[in-house]
């Protein structure tokens, strides 16, 4: 039975040209995390595999930085980056857990950031 839950940064906003940390955290399960995939709608951004390290998709390699932790830092934001992002945790033996983050990239300099998520 899958008992885990994914906590995410939820809905966040950031300024155009700035950067943002996408962060998820899997809790309430003893399952082993083997891999975390980060996706934006229909595109793969990055993969963090416990044994192999990071894979950054070529279309994002200049704007995506691995980490912190299993999170992802998205840089040089554009309005086109607005949308849904998914963290997909591959675990053993539970299977797959998915978290959702909505990012809004604002033109103005008064973008209010949602509460930053901290992994203890």
């Amino acid at each position: 039975m899958m008992t885990g839950t994914i906590e995410t940064t939820g809905n966040i906003s950031a300024e155009k040209g700035g950067s943002i940390i996408l962060q998820c955290h899997l809790s309430s399960t003893t399952a082993q995390v083997t891999q975390v995939n980060w996706e934006q709608q229909d595109q793969l951004l990055a993969i963090c595999n416990a044994d192999l390290g990071w894979h950054i998709s070529p279309s994002f390699k200049d704007r995506v930085a691995p980490g912190p932790g299993l999170g992802l830092t998205l840089q040089s934001l554009t309005v086109n980056d607005t949308g849904e992002y998914f963290c997909i945790y591959h675990t053993y033996p539970d299977g797959t857990y998915t978290g959702r983050i909505f990012l809004e990239v604002l033109e103005s300099s008064v973008a209010e950031h949602g509460a930053r998520f901290q992994i203890p």
């Epitope: 995939n37 996706e39 793969l44 044994d51 192999l52 390290g53 894979h55 950054i56 998709s57 279309s59």
Partner: antibody, heavy 119, light 107 residues
Framework: QVQLVQSGAEVVKPGASVKVSCKAS????????IEWIYQAPGQGLEWIGV????????IYNQKFQGKATLTADKSSNIAYLELSRLRSDDSAVYFC????????????WGQGTLLTVSS | DIVMTQSPSSLSTSVGDRVTITCRAS??????VVWYQQKPGKSPKLLIY???YRYSGVPSRFSGSGSGTDFTFTISSVQPEDFAVYYC?????????FGGGTKVEIK
């Protein structure tokens, strides 16, 4: 330039073991992943597993678990595929392939090693 | 394990023709798909990755597209040197898997 050079063809008896090598040159060995692929005569490609020479981390296709062991020697820039308890259906060409840094895209390939298991 | 089903398994075509090969994943693989070309007795060669980027030095007649579970590989105008076997490959989740291959033959 980047090169992966594999050891030569092997003929071994059923039940024996064999170690195939993949010598890397032209790059920092620990910045690459090395994967291994099996191709039976006239058949398609089958993924055996992958090793991160920097960390020693490995992932195997369950079908080859217990059959294949992947290792890497950072001092000599060589990755190894050891195959044990050989049977006739292990006769195949074995390829190594390398992928640089933040990529799981394997763009450099060895020339292949033909293994024949026969009594 | 994710099964990559390639079709057709073989096709006969003439120089100058357009060729399309499809690959369907048994579950979501996002854009973590690459295409390889293999000629008899040779190692596979990377052609397309992620799944619409041409690898360095690959001619523009080769292209790829797709996302999720359905992927397409196209040769816009087949040349004599393109007769080979083509494989799709997913690296979305381990174990990584290959399609069964498509043999492109001369008609």
């Amino acid at each position: 330039q980047v090169q992966l050079v594999q050891s030569g063809a092997e003929v071994v008896k059923p039940g024996a073991s064999v170690k195939v090598s993949c010598k890397a040159s032209g790059y920092a060995f620990t910045n690459y992943l090395i994967e291994w692929i099996y191709q039976a005569p006239g058949q398609g490609l089958e993924w055996i597993g992958v090793i991160n020479p920097g960390s020693g981390g490995t992932i195997y296709n369950q079908k080859f678990q217990g059959k294949a062991t992947l290792t890497a020697d950072k001092s000599s820039n060589i990755a190894y595929l050891e195959l044990s308890r050989l049977r006739s259906d292990d006769s195949a060409v074995y390829f190594c392939a390398g992928s640089y840094g933040s990529s799981y895209t394997f763009d450099y390939w060895g020339q292949g090693t033909l293994l024949t298991v026969s009594s | 394990d994710i099964v990559m089903t390639q079709s057709p398994s073989s096709l006969s075509t003439s120089v100058g023709d357009r060729v399309t090969i499809t690959c369907r994943a048994s579950q979501h693989v996002s854009t973590a798909v690459v295409w390889y070309q293999q000629k008899p007795g040779k190692s596979p060669k990377l052609l397309i990755y992620s799944p619409s980027y041409r690898y360095s030095g690959v001619p523009s007649r080769f292209s790829g597209s797709g996302s999720g579970t359905d992927f397409t590989f196209t040769i816009s105008s087949v040349q004599p040197e393109d007769f080979a076997v083509y494989y799709c490959h997913q690296h979305y989740s381990t174990p990584w898997t290959f399609g069964g291959g498509t043999k492109v033959e001369i008609k």
